[in-house]
C-alpha cells in the first residue's frame, strides 16, 4: 500500500524555539516515521533537518539548527515505513516574520504603596531578537487579588514602578512584550502575585517640581512632617530602557544631599542637555521613606517652558483671568513662539476640592463662584506639539475674594 504524505504542517516559532506539528494522513498505518528536509533561498539542494528525522510522533523541534532568522527557508516532509511517501512541501517562510515573542520573565519587589517590576526577555541572549532586544516594550495587566478589577498599563520598559497602591494588599499581574517596530505582540507571562508591605512610618515626598531661577534649577516638593532631611538623586532617562546595564546608577546631586528644607537649589551646569529622572527621599534620622515617584526632567524644555503669569479680575460669581508671557529674572517677558495650552486649577481657600479648566485662549473665565468667597488660582502651560508634550511647573497660587452679589455684569 502506498504511504500518503503527511498534511497540514504548522510551524510554531516562539523566541528561539522552532516547533513543527503535522497530521498523519493515514491513522490506520502503524509504525510510521516522519522526516523533514529544508532548503535555503537560492539553493537547489535539500538538507536533512536535524532534530526532525525518523520521528514517530507528530511534533518535532529544530531549535538546534543555526539559521539566519531573516532568510527565507522551505521545508518538506514525508512519511516512511518500508517505503516512503511523496514529499509534501510546506510554504516557504522567514523565521523572524513567523516568530512570536515568548512570555517575559518577571520579578516583583513590594513597597508599602508601590510595586517594582523587573522584566526581562524570556529567552536570554535570544538569536531571534538579537537586533531588537532594546526595542522591546512591555504592557501589563494588574488587579487586586480580592477584587479582580483589571487595570492595563501600556508602553513600559523593563524596570517599572506602579504607585498609589494600598498597603498590605495582594496584587497580581501578568506582562507581555511587544516589538512595535515589527508589529509583534508577545504572549503573557504567567500570573505573578505579591503583597505590599505594612505602611511605612514615613511617606515619600510628593509633588516634585523643577523651575529655573537665574542660572540655577530649583527643585521643590511637599512633605507631611517637619524636621526632616531629604536627599535627591538623578538618572539618565534613557537608562530606563537598559536597567541591566552597569551605568544604571542613581546619582547624588551634591547641593541636594541632606537638605533640611523641602527645596534645593543647584547650578544648571550639573546637567548637560538631556532628559533625566529625579527622585526624592525623606529621613528623620532613624527612619527613611521610600523614594518619591520619579519625575521626568528635560533640560531643554525646562529652560524655556516657564509657568505663565496672570492677572485676576474678580466679579461676584466669576473670575476673569488674563494670562501673560512668563517673566525671566530681571522682569523681562519670555517670548514663547510655540502654541500653548493653559491648565488653570482653582479652589475655595477653605477647601481642598480643586477644579480644573483647560484653555487655549489667554483670557479665561472661571464661572460659578460664590460671592464674597476667597478662591485661589494656579496655572501651568503645556506645549501643544505632540512630539514635545511638555509642561511647565505650576505658577505660585494667587488668592482673590469674589465681589458682593450684584457685580456680575
Amino acid at each position: 500500500k502506498n504511504l500518503k504524505s503527511p498534511q497540514k504542517v504548522e510551524v510554531d516559532i516562539i523566541d528561539d524555539n522552532f516547533i513543527l506539528r503535522w497530521n498523519r494522513s493515514d491513522e490506520s498505518v502503524g509504525n510510521v516515521t516522519f522526516s523533514f528536509d529544508y532548503q535555503k533561498t537560492g539553493m537547489d539542494n535539500w538538507i536533512k533537518l536535524s532534530g526532525c528525522q525518523n520521528i514517530t510522533s507528530t511534533k518535532c523541534n529544530f531549535s538546534s539548527l543555526k539559521l539566519n532568522v531573516y532568510e527565507e527557508i522551505k521545508l518538506r516532509i514525508r512519511a516512511e515505513k518500508e517505503n516512503t511517501s511523496s514529499w509534501y512541501e510546506v510554504d516557504s517562510f522567514t523565521p523572524f516574520r513567523k516568530a512570536q515573542i515568548g512570555p517575559p520573565e518577571v520579578h516583583l519587589e513590594a513597597e508599602d504603596k508601590a510595586i517594582v517590576i523587573h522584566i526581562s526577555p524570556g529567552t536570554k541572549d535570544s538569536v531571534m531578537w538579537a537586533l531588537d532586544g532594546l526595542s522591546f516594550t512591555y504592557s501589563l495587566v494588574i488587579w487586586k487579588n480580592s477584587s479582580g478589577v483589571e487595570e492595563r498599563i501600556e508602553n513600559i520598559y523593563s524596570r517599572h514602578k506602579i504607585y498609589k497602591l494600598s498597603p498590605e494588599t495582594t496584587y497580581c499581574l501578568k506582562v507581555k512584550a511587544a516589538l512595535l517596530t515589527s508589529w509583534k505582540i508577545g504572549v503573557y507571562s504567567p500570573v505573578h502575585c505579591i503583597k505590599t508591605t505594612v505602611e511605612n512610618e514615613l511617606p515619600p515626598p510628593e509633588n516634585i517640581e523643577v523651575s529655573v531661577q537665574n542660572q540655577n534649577y530649583v527643585l521643590k516638593w511637599d512633605y507631611t512632617y517637619a524636621n526632616m532631611t531629604f536627599q535627591v538623586q538623578w538618572l539618565h532617562a534613557f537608562l530606563k530602557r537598559n536597567p541591566g546595564n552597569h551605568l544604571y546608577k542613581w546619582k547624588q546631586i551634591p547641593d541636594c544631599e541632606n537638605v533640611k528644607t523641602t527645596q534645593c537649589v543647584f547650578p544648571q551646569n550639573v546637567f548637560q542637555k538631556g532628559i533625566y529622572l529625579l527622585r526624592v527621599q525623606a529621613s528623620d534620622g532613624n527612619n527613611t521613606s521610600f523614594w518619591s515617584e520619579e519625575i521626568k526632567f528635560d533640560t531643554e524644555i525646562q529652560a524655556f517652558l516657564l509657568p505663565p503669569v496672570f492677572n485676576i479680575r474678580s466679579l461676584s460669581d466669576s473670575f476673569h483671568i488674563y494670562i501673560g508671557a512668563p517673566k525671566q529674572s530681571g522682569n523681562t517677558p519670555v517670548i514663547q513662539d510655540y502654541p500653548l495650552i493653559y491648565e488653570i486649577i482653582f479652589w475655595e481657600n477653605t477647601s481642598n476640592a480643586e477644579r480644573k479648566i483647560i484653555e487655549k485662549k489667554t483670557d479665561v473665565t472661571v464661572p460659578n463662584l460664590k460671592p464674597l468667597t476667597v478662591y485661589c488660582v494656579k496655572a501651568r502651560a503645556h506645549t501643544m506639539d505632540e512630539k514635545l508634550n511638555k509642561s511647565s511647573v505650576f505658577s505660585d497660587a494667587v488668592c482673590e475674594k469674589t465681589k458682593p452679589g450684584n457685580t456680575s455684569k
Epitope: L134, H236, N242, L247, K249, K251, P254
Partner: antibody, heavy 117, light 108 residues
Framework: EVQLVQSGAEVKKPGESLKISCKGS????????IAWVRQVPGKGLESMGI????????RYSPSFQGQVTISADKSITTAYLQWSSLKASDTAIYYC??????????WGRGTLVTVSS | EIVLTQSPGTLSLSPGERATLSCRAS???????LAWYQQKPGQAPRLLIY???SRATGIPDRLSGSGSGTDFTLTITRLEPEDFAVYYC?????????FGGGTKVEIK
C-alpha cells in the same frame, strides 16, 4: 577641571606585590565609574575592570578576574589597582579613566609597570 | 564577552583624503554604548565619539560615527596631519567592557 592623577612608574621583581593609584578631582567622584585599562607596549587597549565608588560595585573583565584587585577610597577620591604576585607578563602601561554614558571621557596619563628579574 | 573586530588593521592615506574605519561586534551592541578613541604615541587615548554618533567635546565635525547592531563606522572626511594615529572602538553595553584591536591610520 576634571583630572585623574596616577601614581608614578614602578619597577618590580616577579612575585612582588604592587598597588597603584588614581586620584580623581574636579567632579563628583562617587557619581562616576573608574575603569582600569592595560596596554602592553606596542599592543592594543584592554579593559581590566571598573569600580563605582558610590556603592563600591566592582566588575572585572573575565580575563582579569582573580589576577588583580580593584578598590576605591571615596573619602580621598582615589581608586586603586593591585597585584599580590606580579609576573613578567604584567609589564604594561596602566591607565585609569572616568566612565559614564559618554564612554571613558577623561583618562589619567598612565602608570608604567615594569616587572623584570 | 563581546569581541570587537576592527578593519583594516592599517590604513595608508594622504592628508585631505577620506578615512573609513570599520568595527564589527560578535553580537548586537546598543548604539548608546559604543565609543571611538584616538591614541597617539606616548599619549593616553582620547574620546572622540560616544553613543555611536555623538561627538565628544572639542572634536571637529570632520569626524563622524554611524552604525547600529553589529556594524559601526568612524569616518574622517578630510584627513588633517593631526589625524594620523591609532583608532579604537569600544563597547560598554556589557560591564565586561571591550576594545577593538585598533586601526592605524598612517601617512601614505
Amino acid at each position: 577641571e576634571v583630572q585623574l592623577v596616577q601614581s608614578g612608574a614602578e619597577v618590580k621583581k616577579p612575585g612582588e606585590s604592587l598597588k597603584i593609584s588614581c586620584k580623581g578631582s574636579g567632579y563628583i567622584f562617587t557619581n562616576y565609574w573608574i575603569a582600569w585599562v592595560r596596554q602592553v607596549p606596542g599592543k592594543g587597549l584592554e579593559s581590566m575592570g571598573i569600580i563605582y565608588p558610590g556603592d563600591s560595585d566592582i566588575r572585572y573583565s573575565p580575563s582579569f578576574q582573580g589576577q588583580v584587585t580593584i578598590s576605591a577610597d571615596k573619602s580621598i577620591t582615589t581608586a586603586y589597582l593591585q597585584w599580590s604576585s606580579l609576573k613578567a607578563s604584567d609589564t604594561a602601561i596602566y591607565y585609569c579613566a572616568r566612565h559614564d554614558i559618554e564612554g571613558f571621557d577623561y583618562w589619567g596619563r598612565g602608570t608604567l609597570v615594569t616587572v623584570s628579574s | 564577552e563581546i569581541v570587537l573586530t576592527q578593519s583594516p588593521g592599517t590604513l595608508s592615506l594622504s592628508p585631505g583624503e577620506r578615512a573609513t574605519l570599520s568595527c564589527r561586534a560578535s553580537q548586537s551592541v546598543s548604539s548608546s554604548f559604543l565609543a571611538w578613541y584616538q591614541q597617539k604615541p606616548g599619549q593616553a587615548p582620547r574620546l572622540l565619539i560616544y553613543g555611536a554618533s555623538s561627538r565628544a567635546t572639542g572634536i571637529p565635525d570632520r569626524l563622524s560615527g554611524s552604525g547600529s547592531g553589529t556594524d559601526f563606522t568612524l569616518t574622517i572626511t578630510r584627513l588633517e596631519p593631526e589625524d594620523f594615529a591609532v583608532y579604537y572602538c569600544q563597547q560598554y553595553d556589557s560591564s565586561a567592557i571591550t576594545f577593538g584591536g585598533g586601526t592605524k591610520v598612517e601617512i601614505k
